[in-house]
């Protein structure tokens, strides 16, 4: 379970039309459910139930986004429509280049993601929890444009990353 180094850049526009970028670094773990690869894309927050619909025409986003899913406590979702692995697969099928799960409220999902699939996804499936998850969700919940870059090596200098 290698460390995933995640950089999140939040873009905030000003009234003059300029924008400011805020970069936040956090760490997660690559799970065995996916590949240990770098990935980058615009963050799309997905509700766990939003991954239930099996309608393949519901590809609302172009390929290359990073899905962020906050898992609920098992008590609040006693009959999940898909396993955590199933949710990751569904997100990738819909065009996610990577999936990040916040497992803070459902840590047993870590075991499920690391059970080792015979057919692991070819995109990274990362999990975060605790303070790192709080940082990520604080950004995601601002509902502003944000991009995530996932790396399996520690980042170098932030200025090298995002080609604007």
């Amino acid at each position: 379970k290698e460390t995933a180094f995640v950089e999140v850049v939040l873009f905030e526009s000003s009234p003059s039309g300029d924008y400011t970028t805020y970069t936040t670094g956090l760490t997660g773990r690559f799970s065995r459910a996916g590949a240990t690869l770098s990935a980058e894309g615009e963050i799309v927050q997905m509700h766990p139930l939003g991954l239930c619909n099996n309608n393949d025409e519901e590809d609302l986003y172009e390929y290359g986004w990073v899905g962020v899913v906050k898992l609920e406590q098992p008590e609040l979702d006693p009959k999940p429509c898909l396993t955590v692995l199933g949710k990751a697969k569904r997100a990738v099928q819909r065009g996610a280049t990577a999936v990040i799960f916040d497992v803070s409220e459902n840590p047993e999902a870590i075991d499920q993601l690391n059970q080792g699939s015979e057919d692991p996804l070819k995109r990274p499936v990362v999990y975060v929890k605790g303070a790192d998850a709080i940082k990520l969700m604080n950004i995601v919940n601002k509902q502003k444009v944000a991009r995530a870059r996932i790396q399996h090596r520690p980042p170098r200098q932030p200025t090298e990353y995002f080609d604007m």
Epitope: E75, K79, V84, E108
Partner: antibody, heavy 118, light 110 residues
Framework: EVQLVGSGGGLVQPGRSLKISCAAS????????MAWVRQAPTRGLEWVAT????????YYRDSVKGRFTISREYAKSTLYLQMDDLTSEDTATYFC???????????WGQGVLVTVSS | QAVLTQPNSVSMSLGSTVKLSCTLN????????VHWYQQYEGRSPTTMIY?????PDGVPDRFSGSIDSSSNSAFLTINNVEIGDEAIYFC?????????FGGGTKLTVL
């Protein structure tokens, strides 16, 4: 290998208290909700209590609310059930179980016999 | 209060197929998962079927689970019954935030 080992049972008089334990190994204890399920002699299974993975919430069947307290100790990977004001109706074998997604009890301990009698 | 009802006992001959039922008296059986446990005399229960129809590793494929919404029931089917299948089988679900178990079916193999 997941293992749940119960202990602390015995004979207790009505109105008295008893605390039973369940030592967990073979998995990350802090990831999972845990539960106690009991089985009276020649009877079926009866859910008693559940505690969430982080111990922040616990749930009880109506007949034990206010008398039983489920708790967990992470340093020892141990689940507890404190039983107060016991009655003969509480006589049973108490199983600890791991509670996982879908509200499944996927692994069960070997059972702790609690007999309430004067 | 929701109740899961199972027949008390079923006797089947060696090599036959048995279908054990578990009926929910109120609410929709499809709203929550049904799980099945096997319990030998004096032993702890073990999971045979979870999430309606999933089989844990190590459980023979002779065991299968299903749901029938028309009868509001869950079923555990055991094909090619063996002597070692003689046990009590309990169904379990989580209904209205309460864990409920069926009374158990004692399977006797003749």
């Amino acid at each position: 290998e997941v293992q749940l080992v119960g202990s602390g049972g015995g004979l207790v008089q009505p109105g008295r208290s008893l605390k039973i334990s369940c030592a967990a190994s073979g998995f990350t204890f802090s990831y999972y909700g845990m539960a106690w399920v009991r089985q009276a002699p020649t009877r079926g299974l009866e859910w008693v209590a559940t505690i969430t993975y982080n111990g922040s919430k616990s749930y009880y069947r109506d007949s034990v609310k206010g008398r039983f307290t489920i708790s967990r100790e992470y340093a020892k990977s141990t689940l507890y059930l404190q039983m107060d004001d016991l009655t003969s109706e509480d006589t049973a074998t108490y199983f600890c179980a791991r509670r996982t997604t879908g509200m499944l009890f996927d692994y069960w301990g070997q059972g702790v016999l609690v007999t309430v009698s004067s | 209060q929701a109740v899961l009802t199972q027949p008390n006992s079923v006797s089947m001959s060696l090599g036959s197929t048995v279908k054990l039922s578990c009926t929910l008296n109120s609410g929709n059986i499809e709203n929550n998962f049904v799980h099945w446990y096997q319990q030998y005399e004096g032993r702890s229960p073990t999971t045979m079927i979870y999430n309606d129809d999933k089989r844990p590793d190590g459980v023979p494929d002779r065991f299968s689970g299903s749901i029938d919404s028309s009868s509001n029931s869950a079923f555990l089917t055991i094909n090619n019954v063996e002597i070692g299948d003689e046990a009590i089988y309990f169904c379990h679900s989580f209904v209205s935030s309460i864990h409920i178990f069926g009374g158990g079916t004692k399977l006797t193999v003749l």
